[in-house]
Interface confidence: low
């Protein structure tokens, strides 16, 4: 997966004038429409419940660090996480609970209960997702917790667990 | 939560001379480039099928009037609705199912089963959602129905109930 | 529904002189933001674990053969399916699995148990997305494999199972 | 380094019960299931049950309902399984072993208790 | 349950020669894992979700299988590899093990 440094934010670049001089189509490529996304997979290990993710994923215009998507440029996001969980059935029924954090405030949560037939069953599969689409400024985070992190499929299907944004409009 | 109202159409802006004059960067900041988006909580109290939302939620672009987002700009519209439903389980299965409308028509739904062992138990959670890519024009209305909008969790997670749109590519 | 057909790719117009000569909109929109864009609902008779849609879709930018969409222009792509099943409950658990292939390869699944029961009971509904944020190359192929595809919904519910893309940022 | 320390050998009469311990260090013992298998010479392996000591939940064997009963103690980061009504055929060496996530997949193994029932 | 079949029993190899042994389940799971075993010691995990290998575990392993029949491989045998080898399903409960393959150096 290709990992992209940001450029320098256009709004440095002189448009007119300097190398791009008369060229429209520099001028155009360096116009302010700014681009930002990551889309990051969840880590092989986890042993809490606020998530970490591989930061060899798809970042750019984004940060990542201890377990936070970082925002760079401010602007309207979308948000989106989408997790695979594996459950042992025990003799009682479980509820999977994913919860997006902005600036660790519980913003959005997705919950659904398994095992609801009360009866210990082979593994039971659940998938959940959740999406936001909210303003972020400058070193806002974005973060993940999951309660039930153990039930989180990190060893079939490592790369079901993932935690993706993009910047739809930027605040120019 | 920002609600920003919608500027003028940059097809009435004098793209040369005017205010902009030789100015590429303003120029380009009122290019043929529109965004349109939406981002709407339920509300609390909801009593019948069709959906009321909270309209002091995110809106750019797009009108909210009596349970419809109201387009204002035609183009291609990525459309996505999420609900969190709570079901105290009769002794029977429960059918839930999410209706996405464009016009009043049912343009697309979501239905899982919950309390599938038919045993009443405690509660259950599950979680839906429902998307949609579309061309829509000028005042088209898009609305959510759900036949059991009783289960529709408004207490316990009163965020979690979303219908969002925005507008992927305009018609210019 | 529309069927779009791509227009020469903007990188062949030339954005100084010719027919835009030095009017900017008329350049502006001709500048380089490709979009690319699908929204295939899935075919009405399935017959094998890779699914078919109907080509009679939206399609902008993007060409449909044999049950693969393939791209035509470079870049990062946001990428969902969504599908309905309806499952007669055998007196076991089923799994049910939608798969999201890039040139063949599985790049993502989502999994989610039903009839967990194990009760041979009425009709049980399940809905099931997948998405994925990802560079694609020209001729990049994406598909969908389901094992279980006899259990799609494509009668009640023609309309809910589909398979949808869109570019977000181009490679130039 | 993620460690599991169980308790010496126990030599019992039969109709009494033994428990034994599972001391974790090394990682964040309350995130891990915790399993217990049995091996008798000639028998090979045979899961007796788990627990998730984060919350007490525990799985196990039918088989050995009844037989054995599993416990934690979060202070102490230490698990315990408890034998009853002890016969010969539960002679053998009880292994616990750390849980990697929910795949039942034991990672970690303690070097074994070795129970020995006799009268 | 389901029922782990392992074989062979017992066997042995040369060391630089191929060794496959096999794990044969009384019906389908999703994955296999496989522990290694050596006298007066715990087991160690060697292979997990059928053909992933445990930290430390030399190359020369390998896993495969699916559906009902599952195997392990060593490339080329050495010395060291000497011990009981054993498969565990994890697709349903309750949690069963193989009764393992002992593979001696010839």
């Known amino acids: 997966q290709r990992t992209d440094s940001i450029p320098n934010s256009p709004d440095n670049v002189p448009l007119k004038g300097g190398n791009c001089s008369e060229d429209l189509l520099c001028i155009l490529k360096r116009a302010p429409f700014k681009k930002s996304w990551a889309y990051l997979q969840v880590a092989k290990h986890l042993n809490k419940t606020k998530l970490s993710w591989n930061k060899d994923g798809i970042l750019h215009g984004v940060r990542y660090q201890d377990g936070n998507l970082v925002i760079q440029f401010p602007g309207l996001y979308f948000i989106i996480c989408q997790l695979q969980f594996l459950v042992q059935c025990p003799n009682n029924s479980v509820d999977l609970k994913l919860e997006l954090l902005i600036n660790k405030h519980i913003k959005k949560q997705a919950l659904v209960t398994v095992c609801e037939s009360g009866m210990q069953t082979k593994h039971v599969y659940q998938n959940l997702s959740q999406f936001l689409l909210d303003y972020l400024q400058v070193n806002t985070t974005i973060s993940v917790n999951v309660d039930t992190f153990q039930y989180i499929d990190t060893s079939t299907f490592p790369l079901e667990n993932v935690l993706s944004i993009f910047l739809y409009s930027n605040s120019d | 939560q920002r609600t920003d109202s919608i500027p003028n159409s940059p097809d009435n802006v004098p793209l040369k001379g005017g205010n902009c004059s030789e100015d590429l960067l303003c120029i380009l900041k009122r290019a043929p480039f529109k965004k349109s988006w939406a981002y709407l909580q339920v509300a609390k109290h909801l009593n019948k099928t069709k959906l009321s939302w909270n309209k002091d939620g995110i809106l750019h672009g797009v009108r909210y009037q009596d349970g419809n987002l109201v387009i204002q700009f035609p183009g291609l519209y990525f459309i996505i609705c999420q609900l969190q439903f709570l079901v105290q389980c009769p002794n029977n299965s429960v059918d839930l199912k999410l209706e996405l409308l464009i016009n009043k028509h049912i343009k697309k739904q979501a239905l899982v089963t919950v309390c599938e062992s038919g045993m009443q138990t405690k509660h259950v959670y599950q979680n839906l959602s429902q998307f949609l890519l579309d061309y829509l024009q000028v005042n088209t209305t898009i609305s959510v129905n759900v036949d059991t909008f009783q289960y529709i969790d408004t207490s316990t997670f009163p965020l979690e109930n979303v219908l969002s749109i925005f507008l992927y590519s305009n018609s210019d | 529904q529309r069927t779009d057909s791509i227009p020469n790719s903007p990188d062949n117009v030339p954005l100084k002189g010719g027919n835009c000569s030095e009017d900017l909109l008329c350049i502006l929109k001709r500048a380089p933001f490709k979009k690319s864009w699908a929204y295939l609902q899935v075919a009405k008779h399935l017959n094998k674990t890779k699914l078919s849609w109907n080509k009679d879709g939206i399609l902008h930018g993007v060409r449909y053969q044999d049950g693969n969409l393939v791209i035509q222009f470079p870049g990062l792509y946001f990428i969902i399916c969504q599908l309905q099943f309806l499952v007669q409950c055998p007196n076991n658990s089923v799994d049910l699995k939608l798969e999201l292939l890039i040139n063949k390869h599985i790049k993502k699944q989502a999994l989610v148990t039903v009839c967990e029961s194990g009760m041979q009971t009425k009709h049980v509904y399940q809905n099931l997305s997948q998405f994925l944020l990802d560079y694609l190359q020209v001729n990049t192929t994406i598909s969908v494999n389901v094992d279980t595809f006899q259990y799609i919904d494509t009668s009640t519910f023609p309309l809910e199972n589909v398979l949808s893309i869109f570019l977000y940022s181009n490679s130039d | 380094r993620v460690q599991l320390q169980q308790s010496g050998a126990e030599l019992v009469r039969p109709g009494t019960s033994v428990k034994i311990s599972c001391k974790a260090s090394g990682y964040a013992f309350t995130n891990y299931w915790l399993g217990w298998v049995k091996q008798r010479p000639g028998h090979g392996l045979e899961w007796i049950g788990d627990i998730y000591p984060g919350n007490y939940n525990s799985y196990s064997n039918e088989k050995f309902k009844g037989k054995a009963t599993l416990t934690a103690d979060e202070s102490s980061s230490t698990a315990y399984m408890q034998l009853s009504s002890l016969t010969s055929e539960d002679s053998a060496v009880y292994f616990c072993?750390?849980?990697?996530?929910?795949?039942?997949?034991?990672?970690?193994w303690g070097a074994g208790t070795t129970v020995t029932v006799s009268s | 349950q389901i029922v782990l079949t392992q074989s062979p029993a017992i066997m042995s190899a040369s060391p630089g020669e191929k060794v496959t042994m096999t794990c044969s389940a009384s019906?389908?799971?999703?994955?296999m894992h496989w522990f290694q075993q050596k006298p007066g010691t715990s087991p160690k995990l060697w292979i997990y979700s059928t053909s992933d290998l445990a930290s430390g575990v030399p190359a020369r392993f390998s896993g495969s299988g699916s559906g009902t029949s599952y195997s392990l491989t060593i490339s080329r045998m050495e010395a060291e590899d000497a011990a009981t080898y054993y498969c565990?399903?994890?697709?349903?409960?309750?949690?069963?093990f193989g009764a393992g393959t002992k593979l001696e150096l010839k």
């Open positions: 019906s389908s799971v999703n994955y």
């Open positions: 565990q399903q994890r697709s349903s409960y309750p949690l069963t």
């Open positions: 072993a750390r849980i990697y996530g929910n795949y039942w997949i034991f990672d970690v």
